[in-house]
């Protein structure tokens, strides 16, 4: 399954929107930073394209879920948030098209499930952190910065997959 060129453009736009969403400076929140344990190994280059597509899909789905909560709507600029949803939705569609094609359905399903579970647990840690910090502006800024970082890492994987073709 070939992801369209627009997919990587969409990823870049998503990162740009995340950058623009910043409301306060991370500098004033240095003490609030937290190691969420991004499962970088689940996005390692050793995986085949067939295995990474569902993991990438899970990552973007979780980002979508995180930013479409009531608490998120209160934290961010509505216009930027709407544009952000649109970009994520388009990327989910691109990835779903690949998943539907049944790429790699029979290939190492257990490995894939473990990776998806690791991504889910990562987002559970982020959700718990926000809850513990009572969805404060600093907590949201820390999460925004973390999502930019992890999304960028997963985007880099998409690019490396494309270049291997």
């Amino acid at each position: 399954c070939d992801l369209p060129q627009t997919h990587s453009l969409g990823s870049r736009r998503t990162l740009m929107l995340l950058a623009q969403m910043r409301r306060i400076s991370l500098f004033s929140c240095l003490k609030d930073r937290h190691d969420f344990g991004f499962p970088q190994e689940e996005f390692g280059n050793q995986f085949q394209k067939a295995e990474t597509i569902p993991v990438l899909h899970e990552m973007i789905q979780q980002i979508f879920n995180l930013f479409s909560t009531k608490d998120s709507s209160a934290a961010w600029d509505e216009t930027l948030l709407d544009k952000f949803y649109t970009e994520l939705y388009q990327q989910l569609n691109d990835l779903e098209a690949c998943v539907i094609q049944g790429v790699g359905v029979t290939e190492t399903p257990l490995m894939k499930e473990d990776s998806i579970l690791a991504v889910r647990k990562y987002f559970q840690r982020i959700t718990l952190y926000l809850k513990e910090k009572k969805y404060s502006p600093c907590a949201w800024e820390v999460v925004r910065a973390e999502i930019m970082r992890s999304f960028s890492l997963s985007t880099n994987l998409q690019e490396s997959l494309r270049s291997k073709e």
Partner: antibody, heavy 123, light 107 residues
Framework: QVQLVQSGAEVKKPGASVKVSCKAS????????INWVRQAPGQGLEWIGM????????SAAQTFQGRVTMTRDTSTSTVYMELSSLRSEDTAVYYC????????????????WGQGTTVTVSS | DIQMTQSPSSLSASVGDRVTITCRAS??????LNWYQQKPGKAPKLLIY???SLQSGVPSRFSGSGSGTDFTLTISSLQPEDFATYYC?????????FGGGTKVEIK
């Protein structure tokens, strides 16, 4: 590409003020903090302070509080650092630096630097 | 303020040598430590962030380790272009503070 371009060298008399500019290009100006760091001749690096170009929020090291003013002009993507009541010890190269890389941003490592502005304070 | 102490303040080494620079924080800073390289008349360059993450475009001969109060920058095989001054910087809490620097000179 991401660039920070600073204003030229300045020579000032003790007691005067100096205003150094730093023009950003190649990225979304309001999305990343800009820091100011100085280096006296033959000495190490010293953090002066930072500004959030979006909100104008600033924070300065205690050593400079009351003497430093950091401002920004979003229309020209430029930040300014003004240091008043200059003394000979303020003779240094002044750098502006931003944090653009995503990992670096989280760990607040300055990954893009201006070329530096030499400020000489002499009577 | 958090004090950052670097050692040694200077060292002489030859091309191909393994070089180690240490940085100690006056209190625990977790892994919020960055390393910079600076050459005469030039702006500093970020080498490593988060104690051990290599900044994009930096050669893999540079590596960082440590957490808490003790950190190390290692150059596995010194190259002619590596002769410079190296600084550590903490980003754990404001104000940001730098180590005094370590000058790496040609033996």
């Amino acid at each position: 590409q991401v660039q920070l371009v600073q204003s030229g060298a300045e020579v000032k008399k003790p007691g005067a003020s100096v205003k150094v500019s730093c023009k950003a290009s190649g990225y979304s100006f309001t999305s990343y903090d800009i820091n100011w760091v100085r280096q006296a001749p033959g000495q190490g690096l010293e953090w002066i302070g930072m500004i959030n170009p979006s909100s104008g929020f600033t924070s300065a090291a205690q050593t400079f509080q009351g003497r430093v003013t950091m401002t920004r002009d979003t229309s020209t993507s430029t930040v300014y650092m003004e240091l008043s009541s200059l003394r000979s010890e303020d003779t240094a190269v002044y750098y502006c630096a931003t944090i653009k890389g995503l990992g670096a941003y989280y760990y607040y490592g300055m990954d893009v630097w201006g070329q530096g502005t030499t400020v000489t304070v002499s009577s | 303020d958090i004090q950052m102490t670097q050692s040694p303040s200077s060292l002489s080494a030859s091309v191909g040598d393994r070089v180690t620079i240490t940085c100690r924080a006056s209190q625990s800073i977790d892994r919020y430590l960055n390393w910079y390289q600076q050459k005469p008349g030039k702006a500093p360059k970020l080498l490593i962030y988060a104690a051990s993450s290599l900044q994009s475009g930096v050669p893999s001969r540079f590596s960082g380790s440590g957490s808490g109060t003790d950190f190390t920058l290692t150059i596995s095989s010194l190259q002619p272009e590596d002769f410079a001054t190296y600084y550590c910087q903490q980003s754990y809490s404001p104000p940001l503070t730098f180590g005094g620097g370590t000058k790496v000179e040609i033996k």
